[in-house]
Interface confidence: medium
């Protein structure tokens, strides 16, 4: 039959070449002379000339050694033709399978692999995977089957078998407990890949295993006892820096300290923060301490980490004895701001109030008083008693010194300590209104026509407060009522001035008396310019010389 079974040829053959592989034979050779040829890659197309055929005998020839890793299988076609060139058989498929030899070593994909694992993990924890390749066949032979192993471990602490490698997958795992970053932060493993499933050629690489920090070390106070001295009343005062040591990785959450005042701070006087660089606990006063109330505080401070502990660890506690130092404290006015109602215009020398201060210090210190700020100079203060008296006329209507009926005075108290200290108080005098101002009209100059004159409306103002203001009453005096009339409107806050008889063009004085609701009377002279005109006017028309 015109058929050839698949031909197996080992790679890297020693020859001699050409080497006879198999004979092509057509049974048509009984009838006629047959000529054989082959075509296909490896014969007449690239890679050309690997195979040939003896034209007349049909022997298939191999011309050179084969490389399975280059081409593992050749597919050729055999042809048989008669002398005249006519095909006597259909083209026959010839399969040549190149069989593998172990001619390649395994090759790691990297010279150095890096991985990491948390310290303290349990045996069996996977760390990383390494990979080696082998170009040889791993399907039909063991030539390309790679087995992994760990050759050595550096350093060999706590012992030399901390890791294992899966012989087939290359997965490196922890095999022993005791990974401790604080002792060994990095291991260097020399790893091997061996073909023939561990019985062949070997190649080597390095796997660097970084041991990651876990919070397996508690911060410890060093020292554990502190004594500090703090002046009383100081707020934000640094009392003490507490120092801790932590074997975990510096500047990591497992190292950074968190401080907590566990006891001794009943009044919430203290606070503790962590210094971002030194990791120290900075104990400061949140409120001022009072020597007279309590001259010593014993604080208990606990330290932990930002990160939780990965195992149960005892926490460290520090004891801080804080001695409060006495300082000469300033006298304090009681109350710090005092509101006193007083009638404006009280007689000079009349008492306004007594305003005194208390000294927080326990010694019986003498306090003396004086006025620190009295803008109008209306008051005096007795240095011994704190009695405030009027030495000037208190004027509620004085807009330069009085705002919203209040006159503000600052007073000072000084003790006789060494050195002496001072405290200030604010005295707010609410001035009660007295009807000491009469009503006044605005404007006080008018221009009016002497024919069909327009009524002049004047606004009435009174510096006093109600009820010492409207309704107002108006009255013309000194014969002004002969030519003029004055009427207050219904609301009682404006006066209407009218010319009731003809006056020649000139300037006249109108004497207007206004009184308020408390009958406080005020006489005002209105300057009236009368013009020769009709109706409304603002200035007299035409050339005119005033009289």
């Amino acid at each position: 039959d015109w058929v050839v079974a698949p031909i197996s040829v080992p790679e890297n053959g020693k020859g001699p070449f050409p080497q006879r592989l198999n004979q092509l034979k057509s049974n048509k050779d009984r009838d006629t002379k047959i000529f054989y040829s082959i075509t296909g890659p490896g014969a007449d197309s690239p890679p050309e000339g690997v195979f040939a055929v003896e034209k007349e005998t049909g022997w298939l020839l191999l011309n050179k050694p084969l490389d399975r890793e280059e081409i593992a299988k050749y597919e050729l076609f055999g042809h048989a033709v008669s002398e005249n060139g006519a095909s006597v058989e259909d083209p026959m498929n010839i399969s040549i399978i190149v069989t593998d030899q172990n001619d390649h070593k395994p090759k790691f994909t990297q010279d150095t692999f890096r991985g990491s694992v948390l310290e303290g993990v349990l045996p069996g924890t996977s760390v990383m995977q390494v990979t080696a390749t082998d170009e040889d066949d791993a399907i039909y032979t063991y030539n390309g089957v790679v087995a992994y192993s760990i050759h050595s471990q550096e350093p060999k602490d706590p012992h030399d078998l901390m890791f294992t490698i899966h012989r087939s997958t290359g997965t490196i795992s922890v095999i022993s407990s005791g990974l401790d970053r604080e002792k060994v932060p990095e291991y260097t493993l020399t790893i091997q890949a061996t073909d023939m499933d561990g019985d062949g050629s070997t190649t080597t690489a390095v796997a660097v295993v970084e041991i990651l920090d876990a919070n397996d070390n508690a911060p410890m106070f060093d020292p554990q006892k502190y004594e500090a001295h703090v002046p009383e009343n100081a707020v934000g005062h640094e009392v003490q820096r507490l120092t801790v040591t932590d074997l975990d990785a510096p500047n990591s959450p497992a190292w950074r300290a968190t401080y907590l005042i566990m006891g001794g701070d009943d009044g919430d006087h203290f606070t503790i923060t962590t210094h971002p660089e030194s990791n120290q606990g900075i104990l400061t006063t949140r409120k001022g301490l009072d020597f007279e109330a309590k001259n010593q505080h014993t604080l208990y401070v606990e330290v932990t980490n930002e990160a939780p502990f990965v195992l149960k660890l005892p926490t460290s506690t520090a004891t801080i004895v804080v001695h409060v130092e006495d300082v000469n404290e300033a006298p304090v006015f009681v109350p710090p701001s005092k509101v006193v109602e007083v009638q404006e215009g009280i007689p000079t020398g009349e008492p306004v109030c007594v305003y005194t201060a208390e000294d927080p210090d326990k010694e019986n210190q003498k306090i003396s008083y004086r006025i620190l700020r009295d803008p109008a100079g209306w008051l005096a203060m007795d240095p011994d008693s704190g009695q405030v008296t009027a030495v000037g006329t208190l004027d509620r209507e004085d807009e330069q010194f009085v705002r919203n009926n209040i006159y503000e005075v600052m007073v000072l108290a000084m003790d006789n300590g060494s050195p002496p200290t001072t405290g200030t108080g604010t005295l707010l005098l609410t001035l009660i209104d007295v009807n000491d101002h009469g009503p006044v009209p605005e404007p006080r100059q008018i221009t009016i026509c002497n024919q069909s004159p327009v009524r002049q409306v004047l606004n009435i103002t009174d510096k006093d407060l109600s009820p010492h203001t409207s309704p107002f009453q108006a009255q013309l005096t000194d014969d002004s009522d002969i030519y003029w009339t004055a009427e207050v409107n219904e609301e009682g806050d404006t006066v209407v001035l009218s010319l009731k008889k003809f006056l020649k063009q000139d300037t006249y004085d109108v004497h207007l008396s206004l009184s308020d609701h408390g009958n406080k009377e005020q006489l005002t002279v209105i300057r009236a310019t009368v013009c020769d005109c009709h109706g409304h006017v603002e200035t007299c028309p035409g050339p005119w010389k005033g009289g």
Epitope: Q110, R114, S116, P155, P185, T188, V208, L247, A249, P250
Partner: antibody, heavy 123, light 113 residues
């Protein structure tokens, strides 16, 4: 201020021993990995050994088994015990502080170096 | 061991000119987990110990003038001095800290032309 000061160098015969010291100040010795690096006369730099914060060590293959790195935290001093010395160990030996304790600090980079001490191995 | 090769071995450059020194590693120094290159550059002046200039291949150490810069990734790295100063005359070394043993380049000697 961080300072490292080496001492203990000198002339020694092949096969002899020498102990180098490195006194450090300005930081706590046990808080950083510390390296020994050497430089043969007119040549480049060669890393020799490291001691980590927890006391673990590593060595260049050329000195493994002959040199031992150690430290005394109470004295803030690093040591390099050199045994079975060879002519090729002749060099200036520097101690050098690692940038940080942790990989992310760039632990393998060395930010502070001593002035070095000369070791001459010759008969 | 990882082999570090620097080029050129020496060079002479005029003051104010740009200088580039190359460093090649026999394997990649890029760690895929953190995308960092485990490479440092040092300057060593005559009679002095080395001084750290750059770590992580491109991070300038504090106090180092900004005319010094590092670049590169994987196996090819460069130290650049943007404008050479007289005080920059020294030998420059690259160093890998990807794995133990740490290894240095053979050094590049920089002189003033």
């Amino acid at each position: 201020e961080v300072q490292l000061l080496e001492s203990g160098g000198g002339l020694v015969q092949p096969g002899g021993s020498l102990r180098l010291s490195c006194a450090v100040s300005g930081f706590t010795l046990s808080s950083y990995p510390i390296n020994w690096v050497r430089q043969a006369p007119g040549k480049g730099l060669e890393w020799v050994s490291v001691i980590w914060t927890g006391g673990g060590t590593n060595y260049a293959s050329s000195v493994k088994g002959r040199f031992t790195i150690s430290r005394d935290n109470s004295k803030n001093t690093l040591y390099l015990q050199m045994n079975s010395l060879r002519a090729e160990d002749t060099a200036v030996y520097y101690c050098a502080k690692s940038r940080g304790v942790y990989d992310f600090d760039g632990r393998g980079a060395m930010d502070y170096w001593g002035q070095g001490t000369l070791v001459t191995v010759s008969s | 061991d990882i082999v570090m090769t620097q080029s050129p071995d020496s060079l002479a450059v005029s003051v104010g000119e740009r200088v580039t020194i190359n460093c090649k590693s026999s394997q990649s120094l890029l760690y895929s987990s953190n995308q960092k290159n485990y490479l440092a550059w040092y300057q060593q002046k005559p009679g002095q110990p080395p001084k750290l200039l750059i770590y992580w291949a491109s991070t300038r150490e504090s106090g180092v003038p900004d005319r010094f810069s590092g670049s590169g990734s994987g196996t090819d790295f460069t130290l650049t001095i943007s404008s050479l100063q007289a005080e920059d005359v020294a030998v420059y070394y690259c160093q890998q800290y990807y794995s133990y043993p740490y290894t240095f380049g053979q050094g590049t000697k920089l002189e003033i032309k």
